[in-house]
Each structure stands twice: as structure tokens, then as C-alpha cells.
């Protein structure tokens, strides 16, 4: 199993969570593995048990404290290790000096709601969750709208190049069911990636008034 291709990837949610995925071709599903975090300037260590998510990959979340507590800063380095049990001892399978603010992936936006809906327009707002105050306004968003008869993958991406937690969708069809999603990304971090997409928000445009088009 050691010779199979392996990969260890972690992201920091900017507050109190480091999420990690360990993949290794040919590894046994029942292998017991964990991630150990050892910061360079903190008194705590943290461990999480890797649980299978697919045939050859495992995931876990290092919970560093209360969800909105700022547990790490831009100067922190966290040495991460994957340890797998082999008989009576633990074997190190991967190691990384992890710079949290170079490897960011925020939580998906929450609290999506329709602020106002018309026949051709819909104003939607959302909130960001567990995002560090360090970012100030240095965030960007992507949004997409699911139209009838299409897939999410076909939906064009709308880019908001600033911290704007609302959008006005236009040129919609009256009396039509839509779904909307949004995701967020800090501008900081060489290996930073987009958050997961938010839960979809379903909404329906208003029907056109009889005899006229508003």
C-alpha cells in the first residue's frame, strides 16, 4: 500500500477548523489513521480520526476551538502528520508544514434569502460563516442560477469581485422556478480555494400581469 500514489491536502476555514483529506491507492478501507496537528507557537496539539469517504480516501476535521474563535494567525505554522496504525505502533505516512492563511477554504455562505422578487428580477442576500475578521473586505464571491431544463454545471458563473453579500438577478422569466447558489473565497493565500457552494435557495418569479409585462 505504501507504494500506491498518496496525497494529503488540508485547508483552514480561517477560524477554528482545519479539514484534511488523505488518499492512498491500494490502502485497506479498515486501516486506522489519524491526523495530528502540532503548531509552532501554540500550547495545544490536536488530533482527528480519518474516516473513509471513498474507496481510497479518508477525511477528518481538526476542531481547534469554538467555531468563531480565532485560533491561528498569518504567522502560525502547523506541522501536520498522517499516522496510520500498523500492528502495535503508529507509522507516519505524510508530513507537512502547513501555513493556515496560505491554504484557506471558507465555510459555504449561509442564510440565503429572497429580499425582493418581481417578474424579471430577484434580489437575494446571504451571510458568510466563520470567516476571520483579518480579511476585512478582501473577499470575492461566485454565484450561479439554475434555470429550468439545465444543470448546475451549465449555469453561467456570476463573479462579485468585492465583499458584497447580495445580488440582483435580472432578465429572469416570469412565473418560473429557479435555484440559486453562492460561494466565497478570500483574496489571500497561494493555495486558497473556493468554499463549497451554499445550499441552493429555491425561488419563483412573479407571474406577468394579464395584458401587460412588468
Amino acid at each position: 500500500a505504501v507504494n500506491g500514489t498518496s496525497q494529503f491536502t488540508c485547508f483552514y476555514n480561517s477560524r477554528a477548523n482545519i479539514s484534511c483529506v488523505w488518499s492512498q491507492d491500494g490502502a485497506l478501507q479498515d486501516t486506522s489513521c489519524q491526523v495530528h496537528a502540532w503548531p509552532d507557537r501554540r500550547r495545544w496539539n490536536q488530533t482527528c480520526e480519518l474516516l473513509p469517504v471513498s474507496q481510497a480516501s479518508w477525511a477528518c476535521n481538526l476542531i481547534l476551538g469554538a467555531p468563531d474563535s480565532q485560533k491561528l494567525t498569518t504567522v502560525d505554522i502547523v506541522t501536520l502528520r498522517v499516522l496510520c496504525r500498523e500492528g502495535v505502533r503508529w507509522r507516519v505516512m505524510a508530513i507537512q508544514d502547513f501555513k493556515p492563511f496560505e491554504n484557506l477554504r471558507l465555510m459555504a455562505p449561509i442564510s440565503l434569502q429572497v429580499v425582493h422578487v418581481e417578474t424579471h428580477r430577484c434580489n437575494i442576500s446571504w451571510e458568510i460563516s466563520q470567516a476571520s475578521h483579518y480579511f476585512e473586505r478582501h473577499l470575492e464571491f461566485e454565484a450561479r442560477t439554475l434555470s429550468p431544463g439545465h444543470t448546475w454545471e451549465e449555469a453561467p458563473l456570476l463573479t462579485l469581485k468585492q465583499k458584497q453579500e447580495w445580488i440582483c438577478l435580472e432578465t429572469l422569466t416570469p412565473d418560473t422556478q429557479y435555484e440559486f447558489q453562492v460561494r466565497v473565497k478570500p483574496l489571500q493565500g497561494e493555495f486558497t480555494t473556493w468554499s463549497p457552494w451554499s445550499q441552493p435557495l429555491a425561488f419563483r418569479t412573479k407571474p406577468a400581469a394579464l395584458g401587460k409585462d412588468t
Partner: nanobody, 125 residues
Framework: EVQLVESGGGLVQAGGSLRLSCAAS????????MGWFRQAPGKEREFVAA????????MYAESVEGRFAVSRENAKNTVYLQMNSLKPEDTAIYYC??????????????????WGQGTQVTVSS
């Protein structure tokens, strides 16, 4: 582009010691995890040791644990492999490798982007 050059190999008697060096040029490796691999005649290349860029994290193959020690000197852009209590089965070409930028050091070759040409280590009985 990163160039890695190993040195320090040679012929040594069983029980002896060698210190391999891996010097990098073309880009600083001060934030890159590094690994050592080896390939014996007629065998596949195998993992030996790895070290994180700060030097805080290390890992070893079971066959060398307690005998080999990996270290680094980022100011010199160099990684070392101190090999003690050498055995004839340690005879191989030793390769230094740089992990993918921003990625963990792992035990598989696929996790490494840049490789040196290797240095021969021969342990006689």
C-alpha cells in the same frame, strides 16, 4: 525550474557512516518538503526519509529508522541524509526529491515534482 544535485556517496564498510547532501538551485526550497528515495539493482525505487521545510517534521522507512537521520539547512538550500550503521542491503543509488510546492511529503514517488540524478552508495561486508 529546480535542479537538485546529490553528493557524498561512495564505498563504505558495513557498520560505517556516510552523509549525503542534496543542493538545490533555480529556486529556494525554504518552503518545500523534501524526500530521499533509493533504488537498489533490480528493484523499484523506494522511500527512505522525508523532512518538512521547517525541519519540525520527519518520517522514515521502517528499514532505516534509528540509523538514518534527515536534516536541512535552508540558508544553504541543502538537505542532508546522515546514514549510520550501514548494512550491505543499504547499497543503492540514493535520490533527493522536492515535493510539489505547497504539498505534503508522502511515501510515494508521485508526490514529488523534482528529482536529482542520484548518488551511488555501496556498502561492502
Amino acid at each position: 525550474e529546480v535542479q537538485l544535485v546529490e553528493s557524498g556517496g561512495g564505498l563504505v564498510q558495513a557498520g560505517g557512516s556516510l552523509r549525503l547532501s542534496c543542493a538545490a538551485s533555480g529556486r529556494s526550497l525554504s518552503t518545500t518538503e523534501m524526500g530521499w528515495f533509493r533504488q537498489a539493482p533490480g528493484k523499484e525505487r523506494e522511500f527512505v526519509a522525508a523532512i518538512t521545510w521547517s525541519g519540525r517534521g520527519t518520517m522514515y522507512a521502517e528499514s532505516v529508522e534509528g540509523r538514518f537521520a534527515v536534516s536541512r539547512e535552508n540558508a544553504k538550500n541543502t538537505v542532508y541524509l546522515q546514514m549510520n550503521s550501514l548494512k550491505p542491503e543499504d547499497t543503492a543509488i540514493y535520490y533527493c526529491a522536492a515535493a510539489r510546492r505547497g504539498r505534503a511529503a508522502v511515501r510515494s514517488e508521485g508526490g514529488y515534482d523534482f528529482w536529482g540524478q542520484g548518488t551511488q552508495v555501496t556498502v561492502s561486508s
